[in-house]
């Protein structure tokens, strides 16, 4: 057992198997479930994380009103198909040949159909609204302190460039974090807002994806910020296509 093997871990994804068998004896980590090599300097894509999760053993308001086209992930967990880059394939199907189209964060954006369903392209989710309610505190958090702390968190923990945190809204006890990232804005190496939002969501639930790190300890000027509920809305570059039957249900 060498020092290299001790060092060969994936700091950003504990759902991996690592060994120094990469080119020239370098460390290489593979995601559980898919066996795909992952870049441990950044966040792993949500698609590979979901796949790994499914393979694991089972255990005057200032607030933004989500648009009529905003999607909420009501379908929950499924075993997704990922492309060679680890992104969601535009069309997802289950074992009973029921298929549907998803956006870049893997959320269904059409009615379910059969194997004849066509999903021409993977539609990008360019705007994510994370809606949090914090537990009661002695007083309201200072808005600018809260804003700075959340921007710091997304940069330092999730590696997301501050320019993609469009706004932080606060109306006690509701906090809203707006993430925006158009296709044209996302450069090679930039963390995807969908991946950052997913890591954040798992952190909030106490299910950190980071290797050997303590859970999320969010504090604003020393005061703990404890979240009691989270809702995430996803807005796509092209509005979703659902039948009227679903919309009126």
């Amino acid at each position: 057992h060498t020092a290299a093997q001790d060092n060969c871990t994936c700091p950003t994804n504990k759902m991996t198997v690592c060994s120094p068998d990469g080119p020239g004896g370098r460390c290489q980590c593979r995601a559980l479930g898919s066996g795909m090599a992952v870049d441990c300097s950044t966040l792993t894509s949500k698609c590979l994380l979901l796949k790994a999760r499914m393979s694991a053993p089972k255990n005057a308001r200032t607030l933004v009103r989500p648009s009529e086209h905003a999607l909420v992930d009501n379908d929950g967990l499924y075993d997704p198909d990922c492309d060679p880059e680890g992104r969601f394939k535009a069309r997802q199907c289950n074992q009973t040949s029921v298929c549907w189209c998803v956006n870049s964060v893997g959320v269904r954006r059409t009615d379910k159909g059969d194997l004849s369903l066509r999903c021409d392209e993977l539609v990008r989710t360019h705007h994510i609204l994370i809606d949090l309610r914090h537990r009661p505190t002695a007083g309201a958090f200072n808005h600018s302190d809260l804003d700075a702390e959340l921007r710091r968190l997304f940069r330092e923990r999730y590696r997301l460039h501050p320019k993609f945190v469009a706004a932080v809204h606060y109306e006690q006890p509701t906090i809203q974090i707006e993430l925006r990232q158009n296709t044209s804005q996302k450069a090679a190496g930039d963390v995807d807002i969908g991946d950052a939002a997913y890591y954040f969501e798992r952190d909030i639930k106490g299910e950190s994806l980071f290797q050997g790190r303590g859970g999320l300890d969010l504090r604003v000027r020393g005061e703990p910020l404890q979240v009691e509920r989270t809702l995430i809305y996803y807005l796509d570059e092209i509005p979703p296509k659902f039948s009227m039957k679903r919309l009126t249900a």
């Epitope: 290299a4 060092n7 994936c10 690592c18 992952v38 870049d39 441990c40 950044t42 330092e156 930039d190």
Partner: antibody, heavy 122, light 109 residues
Framework: QQLEESGGGLVKPEGSLTLTCKGS????????WMWWVRQAPGKGLEWIA?????????TYYASWAKGRFTISSTSSTAVTLQATSLTAADTATYFC???????????????WGPGTLVTVSS | FEMTQTPSSVSEPVGGTVTIKCQAS??????LGWYQQKPGQPPKLLIY???TLASGVPSRFKGSGSGTEFTLTISDLEAADAATYYC????????????FGGGTEVVVK
């Protein structure tokens, strides 16, 4: 634990060279970043490029270095920097350094090589 | 993004105190390092995380600040402190910018 750069020397304008950074007393197959930084005679420090030496090989380049400089890590003991189309302005001591954390945005350099001098002149 | 370091040069007697300032053009939280470089040598890490002393560095060196304003204070100056000092951050490395300040030459009289 130490780093050592090699490959420096006299290069003609428009020429190319490859600098190598080797580590001893530790293995590059860890979860940190390796950096190349240069310093022109009598001037300040200037970052060139960075590479993650764990699983993934992510890289970052200074805007001015993109296209002319290439950082790579083909083994668990060395990091290289290739430079092309060199001019007199590239004359400098080139240092390699090891980042102390696995997060590129929260990095500082706790181990430096002694540097290798590159002189670009005809 | 830019790191502005002041002054570019400072001269103080042995036993004196030197204060070097570093200003980031954007908020970098507490992600700042300070280095000491002597002629013909590579830089040496003094302080990281804006205020944490690196191993083996005497407590005469003190770092402070967060956000955009940072300070390195060297008290009880010794002749061996004569060097050039640099601040550094990698917070905006993905913008392709140099994270080093311009340097401050400290002369000990």
């Amino acid at each position: 634990q130490q780093l050592e750069e090699s490959g420096g020397g006299l290069v003609k304008p428009e020429g190319s060279l490859t600098l190598t950074c080797k580590g001893s007393g530790f293995d590059f197959s860890g979860t940190y970043w390796m950096w190349w930084v240069r310093q022109a005679p009598g001037k300040g420090l200037e970052w060139i490029a960075s590479i993650y030496v764990g699983s993934g090989s992510s890289t970052y380049y200074a805007s001015w270095a993109k296209g002319r400089f290439t950082i790579s890590s083909t083994s668990s003991t060395a990091v290289t920097l290739q430079a092309t189309s060199l001019t007199a302005a590239d004359t400098a001591t080139y240092f390699c350094a090891r980042g102390a954390t696995n997060n590129v945005f929260m990095n500082y350099f706790n181990l430096w090589g002694p540097g290798t001098l590159v002189t670009v002149s005809s | 993004f830019e790191m502005t370091q002041t002054p570019s040069s400072v001269s103080e007697p042995v036993g004196g105190t030197v204060t070097i300032k570093c200003q980031a053009s954007e908020d970098i939280s507490s992600n700042l390092g300070w280095y000491q470089q002597k002629p013909g040598q590579p830089p040496k890490l003094l302080i990281y995380g804006a205020s944490t002393l690196a191993s083996g560095v005497p407590s005469r060196f003190k770092g402070s600040g967060s956000g955009t304003e940072f300070t390195l204070t060297i008290s009880d100056l010794e002749a061996a402190d004569a060097a050039t000092y640099y601040c550094q951050t990698s917070y905006y490395i993905d913008d392709g910018v140099n994270g080093f300040g311009g340097g401050t030459e400290v002369v000990v009289k």
